[in-house]
Interface confidence: low
Amino acid sequence: RKIPKVGHTFFQKPESCPPVPEGSMKLDTGIINENQRVSMSRNIESRSTSPWNYTVTWDPNRYPSEVVQAQCKHLGCINAQGKEDISMNSVPIQQETLVLRRKHQGCSVSFQLEKVLVTVGCTCVTPVVHHVQ
Amino acid sequence: GIAIPRNSGCPNSEDKNFPRTVMVNLNIHNRNTSTNPKRSSDYYNRSTSPWNLHRNEDPERYPSVIWEAKCRHLGCVKADGNVDYHMNSVPIQQEILVLRREPRHCPNSFRLEKILVSVGCTCVTPIVHHVA
């Protein structure tokens, strides 16, 4: 009988694991893939039929300190004539990411992971029509 | 690392950057359960630049599943359901941070990893290059 492929068998804690104080975890902030860059098409936020603006929020006690949020410019979508078509809807597309927050209590510093919902851009959708009986 | 203002009366106050290794309380704040975008909205189907969601799975990562958007068409979908190739469906990309177990399999040791994900698609007017 063919034995199934075992992806990971890590039931015993490896001896090489670093010691971690109670109530916390060790986090290496040296980021894997630090230098990779977004390669989106140019100026899509202004060329989109559901265009958006960017707002940069900056917090020196957060990593990354800059978080960019998008806001849809219109409720409707831009048609071929460059006018807003309110029979369609511009809606935000969102993505969750982790951030690392640094907290100060007097001279002691603690670190906390947070999940942040980032609005990445907007897309044009057909509205959901609710028919009233 | 990032610069951090500190109380000048504290020891080592010249250390303004994030240390390379930190101990973190992993009570993740603001955590909600919208890890599956199919559950959170149906925009991927209703968009004029619709997309499919592909699952990227890695048990050594937190979260272990990340959804990648792939635009269904080169063009955009018109009101009649046909594709308009005078417009382009393009992916919207975002860098996100995830946790990677490092060393592998260790229970409470992680490293931050930056991942580039396509979150959805949007319909854009194409850039027209005029040839002289």
Partner: antibody
Framework: EVQLLESGGGLVQPGGSLRLSCAAS????????MNWVRQAPGKGLEWVST????????YYADSVKGRFTISRDNSKNTLYLQMNSLRAEDTAVYYC???????????WGQGTTVTVSS | EIVLTQSPATLSLSPGERATLSCRAS??????LAWFQQKPGQAPRLLIY???NRATGIPARFSGSGSGTDFTLTISSLEPEDFAVYYC?????????FGQGTKVEIK
């Protein structure tokens, strides 16, 4: 609505075999890791095995390693547990549980009873 | 493997009272800890994930707290349907492990 329905349990003699199935509906089955968890009569819960969404990663508890095999058929939305060389201590209610991306067992089936006795 | 110890084994309370259940881990599990409720003849139901987050559809009277090795499940005011067995479970390390359970019974 997420539904998980286990089947295949029954009475078997020590050394015998059984194959449990878990039929899933209400979610995209191939997108989620799945688990088997068991509960001996009057006892607590014990994790048995995990299989990732595409089946590339498989995990077993030491107590069943080499005897049990987890598998899945994503075209049939079904999870399986092949149990060989059964022992009296394998007697339990076996539950299948869906796993969220963030490692939570968010939905469970109602369980199927396996009794190993001579 | 990580051992989870729940206390007390049994909690005898009346409806309307506050229930406090404890779960202690043999080593830090960060906040990768969940709480489940199980009624006789039924499957477990996820109540709390990541130590303090209520799962979908779980009433606000259930709350979780703690991180590292010490965790608490609190039921602010017991309803008749809350009398059941409660299990904690960790996913910080393989294998996933459960506590032995705390039975909340009617006094």
């Amino acid at each position: 609505e997420v539904q998980l329905l286990e089947s295949g349990g029954g009475l078997v003699q020590p050394g015998g075999s059984l194959r449990l199935s878990c039929a899933a509906s209400g979610f995209t089955f191939s997108s989620y890791a799945m688990n088997w968890v068991r509960q001996a009569p009057g006892k607590g819960l014990e994790w048995v095995s995990t299989i990732s969404g595409r089946g590339g990663s498989i995990y077993y508890a030491d107590s069943v390693k080499g005897r049990f095999t987890i598998s899945r058929d994503n075209s049939k939305n079904t999870l399986y547990l092949q149990m060989n060389s059964l022992r009296a201590e394998d007697t339990a209610v076996y539950y299948c549980a869906k796993e969220e991306a963030t490692w939570d067992f968010d939905y469970w089936g109602q369980g199927t009873t396996v009794t190993v006795s001579s | 493997e990580i051992v989870l110890t729940q206390s007390p084994a049994t909690l005898s309370l009346s409806p309307g009272e506050r229930a406090t259940l404890s779960c202690r881990a043999s080593q830090s599990v960060s906040s990768f800890l969940a709480w489940f409720q199980q009624k006789p003849g039924q499957a477990p139901r996820l109540l709390i994930y990541d130590a303090s987050n209520r799962a979908t559809g779980i009433p606000a009277r259930f709350s979780g707290s703690g991180s590292g090795t010490d965790f608490t499940l609190t039921i602010s005011s017991l309803e008749p349907e809350d009398f059941a067995v409660y299990y904690c479970q960790q996913r910080s390390n393989w294998p996933p492990t459960f506590g032995q359970g705390t039975k909340v019974e009617i006094k």
